[in-house]
Amino acid sequence: HSDGIFTDSYSRYRKQMAVKKYLAAVLGKRYKQRVKNK
């Protein structure tokens, strides 16, 4: 996930936000799956 060649603060911010959103989605799916399996 290189997300381009720009290293300015805005590009870094957008990349960080994307990672947070992605992890939140993944963890949310895992949590829902655990609840569903109980």
Partner: antibody, heavy 109, light 111 residues
Framework: VEESGGRLVTPGTPLTLTCTAS????????MGWVRQAPGKGLEWIGD?????TTDYASWVYGRFTISRTSTTVTLKMTSLTTEDTATYFC????????WGQGTLVTVSS | AAVLTQTPSPVSAAVGGTVTIKCQSS????????LAWYQQKPGQPPKLLIY???TLASGVPSRFSGSGSGTEFTLTISGVQCDDAATYYC???????????FGGGTEVVVK
Amino acid sequence: VEESGGRLVTPGTPLTLTCTASGFSLSSYAMGWVRQAPGKGLEWIGDISTYGTTDYASWVYGRFTISRTSTTVTLKMTSLTTEDTATYFCARDYWLSLWGQGTLVTVSS
Amino acid sequence: AAVLTQTPSPVSAAVGGTVTIKCQSSQSVYDNNALAWYQQKPGQPPKLLIYAASTLASGVPSRFSGSGSGTEFTLTISGVQCDDAATYYCLGGYYDPADNAFGGGTEVVVK
């Protein structure tokens, strides 16, 4: 960068536009969509990260959806009105550093 | 959503002269410098000139420069050439990307 899928549609018809790339790996870049109505200015629609997470302009109101595979980025549009008539551009990076020629979407009854 | 207001069109310039285009945002851009400038000629897609308020994009001539911070930004073209006749747009990036927006554009006419 190349966009495709633009055509004449009637109001309310859904339409999907596709963006492909040559000379670089699309999967390594965030990609954005921008539109331009005939004779008007540029309008930012939204973008998609390499992780597949998306952000949209506040005016989109869930009518448009951006998604991606390893080789394409798509813009799915629903509830189209005549106001959505425009050339739709796909561009690379959050800073929109490389643009395609655009694909024309005409919404008319 | 943010509103970006640009210098009204058209702006006239003589070859060899200097052109200044202003872009004012209704709210501060991210980190006070998340602003880009684009050049668009008729029938062509836009081209990135400046990003992060003042950083020149790859391959862009040094006669283009950007400045400003927060809500007020400027694109300057020094030593204007005929090839610079185009419409110029600013794009603001914000803490909430839902606010991202372009300015209305400024047409530059070269005499």
